[in-house]
């Protein structure tokens, strides 16, 4: 469960992929799109406010039931929208919701090697928000294997101003 | 209840090696990220090493690379340095520091040992 | 690497004082900062994460606040338990690195 409806810390900041594709955002019929495309250099990047929340660890081994914590996130580029897991057909998309947000909008924080994160569905362990074919997907990984295949890693650029929603 | 007990340390000459160990309870350790720091006698806290879980990715300070070795065996709940090839400034008190979250090192290190100590003298 | 630069180095206060430690970093991140008490042969104690976050089990004197490359931790109704170093640690991006401590002593 998580530990408290609010957020321990927000913060401001553009997301791109391992080889440095930009994740943008685009209205569409009402409707919000999500590209993973090459930027131009003069086009600024898309911002995305960053929600963190703590969750206790379901225990395996300590008696008191938890185990420590996760960091969960979830991901808003524009106001009263959010990322959120569609497992059903495998994609991210983005849904006008209000609070509380479902579980679908929240996303296990992992911190890779080369300052790089990935995001798990809270609602499926194991699914990861990924690359595939220049959009975002929801890509099942191994645990067995090494969770540093690329196309699940992305890279946070902190946007140091009031981290409040942009409109 | 955690507990991370450190054990290994001692006097070596330069040029030795010494393996360090780590024995964690009370809580899931195969969950988590857990890291060496080091403290020089009468300095700061120092960052030495670091294995994350899942991927197992490893971070070693510049002034260790290539002499120290991080591992784990979760079967046994215990954490490792192999220490080789020491020099007089290795000398230090040794930590083992479990991270915060479990998946992030965005909480820092929410448990320590209580240290073991590494002493590099001829 | 972001380097962690603390102040003062040390200070003297008594019992009740209310103290106030900074701690600047080299370049800006949000709130990915933590802070430690260590007393003499004794290993860390987190006591606050996220700039902010009050572990559980430490006193409600002790609190966080910053963000951006300026953080502080204030301890108000200082008592004798309290005096010990102080070290903040970033930990935003690897490699996480730490302050070079803050010691509290007895006026």
């Known amino acids: 469960s998580i530990t408290g409806i609010s957020p321990i810390t927000e913060s401001l900041a553009s997301l791109s992929t391992y080889n440095d594709q930009s994740i943008t955002f685009a209205l569409e019929d009402e409707s919000y799109e999500i590209y993973v495309e090459d930027l131009k250099k003069d086009k600024k990047k898309d911002k995305v406010l960053l929600s963190y929340y703590e969750s206790q660890h379901p225990s395996s081994e300590s008696g008191d039931g938890v185990d420590g914590k996760m960091l969960m996130v979830t991901l808003s580029p524009t106001k009263d929208f959010w990322l959120q897991a569609n497992n059903k057909e495998h994609s991210v998309e983005l849904h006008k919701c209000e609070k509380p947000l479902p579980d679908q909008a929240f996303f296990v924080l992992h911190n890779r090697s080369f300052n790089c994160v990935s995001f798990e569905c809270k609602t499926d362990p194991g699914v990861f928000i990924g690359v595939k074919d220049n959009h975002l997907a929801l890509i099942k990984v191994d645990y067995s294997e090494n969770l540093g295949s690329e196309n699940i890693l992305f890279k946070l650029s902190e946007i140091l101003e009031h981290h409040h929603h942009h409109h | 209840e955690v507990q991370l007990v450190e054990s290994g340390g001692g006097l070596v000459q330069p040029g030795g090696s010494l393996r360090l160990s780590c024995a964690a309870s009370?809580?899931?350790?195969?969950?988590?990220?857990m890291s060496w720091v080091r403290q020089a006698p009468g300095k700061g806290l120092e960052l030495v090493s670091d294995?994350?879980?899942?991927?197992?990715?490893?971070y070693y300070a510049d002034s260790v690379k290539g002499r120290l070795t991080i591992s784990r065996d979760n079967s046994k709940n215990t954490l490792y340095l192999q220490m080789n090839s020491l020099r007089a400034e290795d000398t230090a008190v040794y930590y083992c520091?479990?991270?915060?979250?479990?998946?992030?090192?965005?909480?820092?290190?929410?448990?320590w040992g209580q240290g073991t100590l590494v002493t590099v003298s001829s | 690497d972001i380097q962690m630069t603390q102040s003062p180095s040390s200070v003297s206060a008594s019992v009740g004082d209310r103290v106030t430690i900074t701690c600047r970093a080299s370049?800006?991140?949000?709130?990915?900062l933590a802070w430690y008490q260590q007393k003499p042969g004794k290993a860390p104690k987190l006591l606050i994460y996220?700039?902010?976050s009050l572990q559980s089990g430490v006193p409600s004197r002790f609190s966080g606040s910053g963000s951006g490359t300026d953080f502080t931790l204030t301890i108000t109704n200082l008592q004798p338990e309290d005096f010990a170093t102080y070290y903040c640690?970033?930990?935003?991006?690897?490699?996480?690195?730490f302050g070079g401590g803050t010691k509290v002593e007895i006026k």
């Open positions: 520091a479990k991270s915060h979250y479990s998946t992030s090192w965005f909480g820092g290190f929410d448990y």
């Open positions: 009370g809580f899931t350790f195969r969950s988590f990220a």
């Open positions: 294995l994350r879980t899942s991927g197992g990715s490893t």
């Open positions: 370049q800006g991140f949000s709130s990915w």
């Open positions: 996220a700039a902010s």
């Open positions: 640690q970033q930990a935003n991006s690897f490699p996480l690195t």
